[in-house]
């Protein structure tokens, strides 16, 4: 028969008491060996009953050098089946075997879940020599059992290439349930339900879960593991754990957070990086995100302007980085600039608004009547032209640019001259003679240079030529006009 | 389906003692706890406690203590409700209801009326 | 305890009419559960949780609130919803039903 030895059930129905064939204890095996050296009685590991017939592994000696007779089969006594204690305690077990004392190097190994037990495991075999057989006692001891020492411990043991293997040793370690899955943090939409998942393990079986909601029960009664909780919506953010529950006691989950998605916090700190005639630099920080991530971003520009509409300019953009060059400006002009962000919910409200403004623009106009002519005396080339009509924004003028090429036998020279902004007229040097002078004129001011005048171009001739006419800026439409003298 | 079904009408002299039946049926009788909620004439839903029918432990509310007890009888999955002593202003319609998450009664007995009088 | 406050007690509409009950509780609630009685019956689940509607009930009713808060709305009233509604708090111990609001035909 099997040996068994067990607690009296407990009559709480919830959680089943030990399997039969099965030892429950928080205390070191009663059918262990004390650590002590000497003669232990075998009788402490094999029931004093004739053991029922063995199934499992057995040597079968041959006949002895007498040949008179046959020696019985070789098998592991039984033992106790099943162990449960729980965590932290510390259990000793053991089997044993009478071996005939025909055999020599006898060794036992310890296996757990069909692997071997090497190394630092607390392993001891003792052997008592009688005149025709050994007995063999190996006993396997844990110190604080824990859960990874669950398992199915067999010996095993070697005689002429022969394999003997005793009845398994279930050990069962039992304590607090174990969560393998807890409730996650979450962002949630408003009123829209969601779920939340708890499950734990024991042993002991069964685990059952109790969910909690800002410190309230949510289920008035235990809901086996895995358990799954639908949340009917929520409305503020909430804070949600699980409890666990078994024979031994309670486990109580990380408490997570679960926040309701709302629109985003205004962006702060909106500041100017660079301005220019038609351009800003914009950069902000982003508010609050709103348990959502930013999908983009809003600049709004207004024109500060009493005579201005009141327009709303909107450039939308990516989210990150947060900046924005804002373009399509009018040069020295002022704006109020604001940003607002969006996630998933909606729109931020808008940021504080802030002025920024435009620098000087450059001419938007070249100057006019652009007229050249060579004055053969002084060998140089007298130019005219009339001030453009720039607008306020453009700025004050504060000069002209004049572009010079001289073009002569495939070779061409590109010069430049800068001119005070009361000119209205200059003179060049002839840089080459019996070549080509086109002049082109553009007007100057802090925000630029503006675009420059149609081409006029004039024949500079060899030496001893009379200058006659002039060139000048051709009307719209016409060819440019060389004039030779 | 769920169902509960609630003992008969029951009319007592005062002092006397009086046993309220709730027979449940159409789901695992363990897996939910039972609520007992009092109306009296006239008046609105008054709740007295409720039995969990997982450990047996009962649960009532201020005022329902003492004279009132909440008990079950799994195999048959039934909760009980007595009330002993019986006073006059104990006259009302009592009333079982089967209790989900968040206390939600999704089920409720059809009532059993109590009318106590000399 | 957490006492709930149903207001108005007595709502008179006629067919056709939009109700809105209203229930407020004596400190934060999460949850607030509404039920139908009819005479000589038993309570009929109505909203659970806030704002669900419980299995069979018409998509005229409706459910709202939170923290201190909570409404029931009838967007059309039927004859059949003339009865007496009662909300019910679930957030602490004990389980608290406020005192109803009986919708009656004007």
């Known amino acids: 028969a099997i040996t068994e030895a067990r607690e009296e059930a407990k009559p709480y129905p919830l959680f089943p008491g030990p399997l039969p064939g099965s030892l429950q204890t928080d205390h070191t095996s009663l059918l262990s060996l004390p650590h002590t050296s000497g003669y232990q009685p075998a009788l402490m590991f094999s029931p004093t009953q004739p053991g029922r017939p063995y199934t499992g592994n057995v040597a079968i000696p041959r006949v002895t050098s007498a040949g008179s007779k046959l020696l019985p089969p070789l098998a592991f006594k039984h033992t106790v089946g099943h162990i449960i204690l729980s965590e932290h305690k510390d259990v000793k077990f053991n089997c044993s075997i009478s071996v005939p004392n025909i055999y020599q190097d006898t060794t036992i190994s310890w296996w757990k879940d069909g692997k071997e037990l090497l190394g630092a495991h607390h392993a001891i075999t003792q052997f008592y020599p009688d005149d025709e057989v050994t007995a063999i006692i190996a006993s396997f001891s844990i110190t604080s059992v824990q859960r990874s020492d669950n398992g199915s411990y067999i010996c095993k043991m070697k005689i002429n290439n022969e394999e003997i293997v005793s009845d398994p040793i279930y050990i069962e370690v039992q304590g607090l349930p174990h969560f393998t899955k807890q409730p996650e943090s979450m962002n949630v939409t408003r009123n829209t339900a969601f779920n939340l998942t708890c499950q734990a393990v024991g042993p002991p079986e069964p685990v059952n879960i109790f969910w909690v909601q800002n410190s309230s029960r949510v289920n008035e009664q235990p809901e086996k593991s895995p358990s799954v909780l639908t949340v009917p919506g929520l409305t503020e953010m909430a804070v949600f754990s699980c409890e666990a529950h078994n024979d031994k006691g309670l486990t109580v989950s990380k408490g997570v957070q679960i926040n309701i998605k709302a629109i985003p916090s205004p962006p702060t700190e909106v500041s100017i990086h660079n301005s220019t005639a038609h351009s800003i630099l914009i950069s902000w920080v982003p508010g609050f995100d709103g348990y959502s991530p930013f999908r983009n971003c809003s600049v709004q520009v207004k024109e500060v302007d009493p005579l201005s509409n009141g327009s709303v300019m909107i450039f939308n953009t990516s989210a990150s980085p947060h900046m924005y060059q804002i373009k399509q400006l009018q040069a020295l002009a002022n704006y109020s600039i604001g940003v607002s962000c969006m996630n998933e919910i909606g729109w931020s409200a808008v940021s504080p608004w802030i002025l920024a403004s435009t620098t000087e623009g450059a001419p938007s106009v070249a100057p006019l009547n652009v007229t050249v002519f060579l004055n053969e005396s002084r060998d140089n080339v007298d130019i005219r032209w009339m001030k453009p009509l720039t607008k306020r924004q453009a700025g004050e003028l504060v000069g002209y640019r004049i572009s010079h090429v001289w073009q002569s036998a495939g070779i061409s020279k590109e010069l430049l001259e800068e001119v005070g902004q009361n000119n209205s007229r200059a003179q060049i040097s002839v840089q080459v003679h019996n070549a080509t002078c086109t002049v082109r004129i553009a007007a100057v001011t802090k925000g630029g240079v503006g675009p420059f005048s149609d081409p006029v171009k004039i024949f500079i001739p060899a030496h001893g030529w009379v200058d006659h006419a002039p060139s000048s800026t051709p009307a719209p439409g016409n060819a440019d006009p060389v004039l030779i003298i | 389906q769920v169902q509960l079904v609630q003992s008969g009408s029951e009319l007592k002299k005062p002092g006397a003692s009086v046993k309220v039946s709730c027979k449940a049926s159409g789901y695992t009788f363990t897996n939910y706890g039972v609520h007992w909620v009092r109306q009296a004439p006239g008046q609105g839903l008054e709740w007295m406690g409720w039995?969990?029918?997982?450990?047996?432990?009962?649960t009532y509310a201020q005022g329902f203590t003492g004279r009132f007890v909440f008990s079950l009888d799994t195999s048959v999955s039934t909760a009980y409700l007595q009330i002993s002593s019986l006073k006059a202003e104990d006259t009302a319609v009592y009333y079982c209801?089967?209790?989900?998450?968040?206390?939600?009664?999704?089920?409720w007995g059809q009532g059993t009326l109590v009318t106590v009088s000399s | 305890e957490i006492v709930l406050t149903q207001s108005p007690a007595t709502l008179s509409l006629s067919p056709g009419e939009r109700a809105t009950l209203s229930c407020r509780a004596s400190s934060s609630v999460s949850y607030m559960h509404w039920y139908q009685q009819k005479p000589g019956q038993a309570p009929r689940p109505l909203i659970y949780a806030t704002s669900n509607l419980a299995s069979g009930i018409p998509a005229r009713f409706s459910g709202s609130g939170s923290g201190t808060s909570y409404t029931l709305t009838i967007s059309s009233l039927e004859p059949e919803d003339f009865a007496v509604y009662y909300c019910q708090q679930w957030s602490s111990n004990p389980r608290t039903f406020g005192g109803g609001t009986k919708v009656e035909i004007k």
């Open positions: 209801a089967r209790g989900n998450r968040y206390a939600y009664m999704d089920y």
């Open positions: 039995g969990n029918t997982y450990t047996g432990e009962p």
